[in-house]
């Protein structure tokens, strides 16, 4: 048992096995339900954290769709196929062959069919709204300290880079949250947005995926911001095909 | 704990070389950024490349690094840097350095190695 | 991106005070370390985090700032103060930028 063995964790998921075993003895980590390898010094991408998710399921969670293009994440959980990046794969199916498109949050874009349902290509969700209300407090937050701390905290604890918050909006106690990434913008070792709001989703109901690490304490000036709920709404480059029964 | 650098020395105009940084007392298996960062006579500090040693291995270069420098780690012990093209401006001191936080952009250096001296000239 | 530091050289009898600036060209919170070089040898880190004093480091050196404008403090110069000191930031790495000041040349007469 060596130092190397003691160092050797994934301080961004604890949903990883780790093991030096790498080349040369170096610490590699794989992602709990899909085994796969995983870059512990980045974000994990959302599918491989549902899957491993999956491998201990919860309780499947509902949200609100507010307008026609805006897609939120109303299936709740599923075991979803990750392609050999960890992205999700375009179409994905059930156990019972029921198979429905889905963007790269992994939200479905199409009405559900059946095993012959086509879909050409991963449309990329470029842009996330996050929407939260914040408990009461004792008077509204200065809205240029907000601003600076969630850009911070995006940076900091998620490694977003600062240019892809684009705007960080207020009206007490509602706080929105916009995050832009187009496919021309994303370089490599960029954090994709979706990944960053999942991370952020997770903390703010308390399941941090963090190593070892306390919960997210989101302060503004000292005062504590203490988020009651969270909606988050996916906008994609293309937008979703339903069919106009489910709109109605 | 220690870091060293080795395989400095005179190289030729348009020449390659490959310089390696030995840690001792300490793996190169934790969750921590190794850097390389350079010096030309008489100036000041630039970063060239750092890499991630734990589970990963990203990278990051310079803007003028890109497609001339690699840095790499291949095992939990080194970890290099190959240097290709090089032109007499690419002479400096050679340092690594290791990061004191998993996260590379909140990355400062609290382990240095001496430096080696890389002189490009014909 | 850029890291701005000035003077680019201060000269102090012993006993005085030097104040080095930092300022980076955009908002890096408190994610700033100051160093200190020797000739001859590699850089020492003072403080990171913008004022947290690297071990074994003592208190004279003070670093203050966040944001965008950043402070180093020596204060008592002694003669073993003379170096280069280095302000330098990771925070827009991503940017392919150096996250280094040019340095400032500190002279204790």
């Known amino acids: 048992h060596t130092a190397a063995q003691d160092n050797c964790t994934c301080p961004t998921n604890k949903m990883t096995v780790c093991s030096p075993d790498g080349p040369g003895g170096r610490c590699q980590c794989r992602a709990l339900g899909s085994g796969m390898a995983v870059d512990c010094s980045t974000l994990t991408s959302k599918c491989l954290l549902l899957k491993a998710r999956m491998s201990a399921p919860k309780n499947a969670r509902t949200l609100v769709r507010p307008s026609e293009h805006a897609l939120v994440d109303n299936d709740g959980l599923y075991d979803p196929d990750c392609d050999p990046e960890g992205r999700f794969k375009a179409r994905q199916c059930n156990q019972t062959s029921v198979c429905w498109c889905v963007n790269s949050v992994g939200v479905r874009r199409t009405d559900k069919g059946d095993l012959s349902l086509r879909c050409d290509e991963l449309v990329r969700t470029h842009h996330i709204l996050i929407d939260l209300r914040h408990r009461p407090t004792a008077g509204a937050f200065n809205h240029s300290d907000l601003d600076a701390e969630l850009r911070r905290l995006f940076r900091e604890r998620y490694r977003l880079h600062p240019k892809f918050v684009a705007a960080v909006h207020y009206e007490q106690p509602t706080i929105q949250i916009e995050l832009r990434q187009n496919t021309s913008q994303k370089a490599a070792g960029d954090v994709d947005i979706g990944d960053a709001a999942y991370y952020f989703e997770r903390d703010i109901k308390g399941e941090s995926l963090f190593q070892g690490r306390g919960g997210l304490d989101l302060r503004v000036r000292g005062e504590p911001l203490q988020v009651e709920r969270t909606l988050i709404y996916y906008l994609d480059e293309i937008p979703p095909k339903f069919s106009m029964k489910r709109l109605t | 704990q220690q870091l060293e650098e080795s395989g400095g020395g005179l190289v030729k105009p348009e020449g390659s070389l490959t310089l390696t940084c030995k840690g001792s007392?300490?793996?190169?298996?934790?969750?921590?950024w190794m850097w390389w960062v350079r010096q030309a006579p008489g100036k000041g500090l630039e970063w060239i490349a750092p890499i991630y040693v734990g589970s990963g291995s990203s990278t990051y270069y310079a803007s003028w690094a890109k497609g001339r420098f690699t840095i790499s780690s291949t095992s939990s012990t080194a970890v290099t840097l190959q240097a290709t093209s090089l032109t007499a401006a690419d002479t400096a001191t050679y340092f690594c350095?290791?990061?004191?936080?998993?996260?590379?952009?909140?990355?400062?250096?609290?382990?240095w190695g001496p430096g080696t001296l890389v002189t490009v000239s014909s | 991106f850029e890291m701005t530091q000035t003077p680019s050289s201060v000269s102090e009898p012993v006993g005085g005070t030097v104040t080095i600036k930092c300022q980076a060209s955009e908002d890096i919170s408190s994610n700033l370390g100051w160093y200190q070089q020797k000739p001859g040898q590699p850089p020492k880190l003072l403080i990171y985090g913008a004022s947290t004093l690297a071990s074994g480091v003592p208190s004279r050196f003070k670093g203050s700032g966040s944001g965008t404008e950043f402070t180093l403090t020596i204060s008592d110069l002694e003669p073993a103060d003379a170096a280069t000191y280095y302000c330098?930031?990771?925070?827009?790495?991503?940017?392919?930028?150096?996250?280094f000041g040019g340095g400032t040349e500190v002279v204790v007469k």
């Open positions: 350095a290791r990061g004191a936080t998993n996260n590379v952009f909140m990355n400062y250096f609290n382990l």
């Open positions: 330098q930031t990771s925070y827009y790495i991503d940017d392919g930028v150096n996250g």
């Open positions: 007392g300490f793996d190169f298996s934790g969750t921590y």
